[in-house]
């Protein structure tokens, strides 16, 4: 094995452990919580990411609803079981027998039941909406430079391919960003927008998850864009399901 | 040369707790993971948990979780594994190593549980 | 936890021959895999790390494949002094496991 390397660290994942004892002495990099070791030129998968925050704070979220079939990560953090690749497995279950399946996010899109309870297929979130409230400004920023900026965060922070990127829509004080990522369109080596989605809105809290890097300064024409309020929708490609006393509720 | 020597043979009654020490040298103590690993006797190996000097997070096997507390102290390079409530299937080889491949081992350590 | 079954459980080989020892896991772990020989009264010794990387020191008489769930420990010819117990150890996840071994016996 080769000496500790001077900068053994993971740029990408600050909830890792990293030493020098990967294939040839390198540089390896783990998940806390689940000791998988991850990719650190690319973003860690959200599965990995919420198995390292489990001593975080509950951050619960209710967001409104663009269209009958969105959802909305209601249920706030919980411990998820991961695939051999890190990605969410359909069907997670809590320590009390409790099970629901999730779709490629990690969102809850069934009822809850029991142990019997069969997820088929981890079913993907093909259409993401990023629903941002920006503080106050002197006036409104200029349509296509916040559009070209958003869009270089994602190209440039979060290494996501410009054609994930959909559409930046803006009425002031409203910013919505649509990701989407239809399965037969991710290549392998893409980040998907569910990752994206999850360092952006854990960097728009002030949570970054980039290792030594500065929190986000998101500045459009040099005018500081703060934002106020996130709501997030995931859209997948197969509608939830969902009892009828859920949706009246 | 890297070395991991750890702390002699101890007999415990059950019910009593038990400390191993293991002291690392030939390398910087602080940048590999050092994990705990057991054998009883006539028994295959059993990973209890690991520690990561550098900043003390370590992670158990659910198996230890409640009675197994692992520690370290830079200063003298050493790791060191509690295991308490002690009882007769205790009664193991314990071994410090080191990294992720188990690259280099301790002698062990016998605990008697009696 | 990841699973690891060693076969066989016992193996009865003569000097100088090829002896081919197993190792399956219970889900991919790419080649997260690593073997040691342990002697009666000794600790375990790392003979090959993730799969197939060799170890410095160790004899080129012993080589490890695979990846994904299916591994191989190969002595191409053996020495009386390999005669031992062989194990298997993961370390894709916490937390880590071992195969049970396999015991190399002198036929």
């Known amino acids: 094995h080769t000496a500790a390397q001077d900068n053994c660290t993971c740029p990408t994942n600050k909830m890792t452990v990293c030493s020098p004892d990967g294939p040839g002495g390198r540089c390896q990099c783990r998940a806390l919580g689940s000791g998988m070791a991850v990719d650190c030129s690319t973003l860690t998968s959200k599965c990995l990411l919420l198995k390292a925050r489990m001593s975080a704070p509950k951050n619960a979220r209710t967001l409104v609803r663009p269209s009958e079939h969105a959802l909305v990560d209601n249920d706030g953090l919980y411990d998820p079981d991961c695939d051999p690749e890190g990605r969410f497995k359909a069907r997670q279950c809590n320590q009390t027998s409790v099970c629901w399946c999730v779709n490629s996010v990690g969102v809850r899109r069934t009822d809850k039941g029991d142990l019997s309870l069969r997820c088929d297929e981890l079913v993907r979130t093909h259409h993401i909406l990023i629903d941002l409230r920006h503080r106050p400004t002197a006036g409104a920023f200029n349509h296509s430079d916040l559009d070209a900026e958003l869009r270089r965060l994602f190209r440039e922070r979060y290494r996501l391919h410009p054609k994930f990127v959909a559409a930046v829509h803006y009425e002031q004080p409203t910013i919505q960003i649509e990701l989407r990522q239809n399965t037969s369109q991710k290549a392998a080596g893409d980040v998907d927008i569910g990752d994206a989605a999850y360092y952006f809105e854990r960097d728009i809290k002030g949570e970054s998850l980039f290792q030594g890097r500065g929190g986000l300064d998101l500045r459009v024409r040099g005018e500081p864009l703060q934002v106020e309020r996130t709501l997030i929708y995931y859209l997948d490609e197969i509608p939830p399901k969902f009892s009828m006393k859920r949706l009246t509720a | 040369q890297v070395q991991l020597v750890q702390s002699g043979a101890e007999v415990k009654k059950p019910g009593a707790s038990v400390k191993v020490s293991c002291k690392a040298s030939?390398?910087?103590?602080?940048?590999?993971?050092i994990n705990w690993v057991r054998q009883a006797p006539g028994q295959g190996l059993e990973w209890m948990g690991n520690?990561?000097?550098?900043?003390?997070?370590?992670n158990y096997n659910q198996k230890f979780k409640d009675r197994v507390t692992m520690t370290r102290d830079t200063s003298t390079s050493t790791v060191y594994m509690e295991l308490s409530s002690l009882r007769s299937e205790d009664t193991a080889v314990y071994y410090c190593?080191?990294?992720?491949?188990?690259?280099?081992w301790g002698q062990g350590t016998l605990v008697t549980v009696s | 936890e990841i699973v690891l079954t060693q076969s066989p459980a016992t193996l009865s080989l003569s000097p100088g021959e090829r002896a081919t020892l197993s190792c399956r896991a219970s889900?991919?772990?790419?080649?997260?895999i690593h073997w040691y020989q342990q002697k009666p009264g000794q600790a375990p010794r790392l003979l090959i790390y993730?799969?197939?990387e060799s170890i410095s020191g160790i004899p080129a008489r012993f080589s490890g494949s695979g990846s994904g769930t299916d591994f191989t420990l190969t002595i191409s010819s053996l020495e009386p002094e390999d005669f031992a117990v062989y194990y298997c150890?993961?370390?894709?996840?916490?937390?880590?496991?071992f195969g049970q071994g396999t015991k190399l016996e002198i036929k």
């Open positions: 190593a080191r990294g992720s491949s188990f690259d280099y």
């Open positions: 993730y799969a197939s």
């Open positions: 030939g390398y910087t103590f602080t940048s590999y993971w």
């Open positions: 150890q993961q370390s894709n996840s916490w937390p880590f496991t």
């Open positions: 889900q991919t772990i790419g080649t997260s």
């Open positions: 520690i990561y000097p550098s900043d003390s997070y370590s």
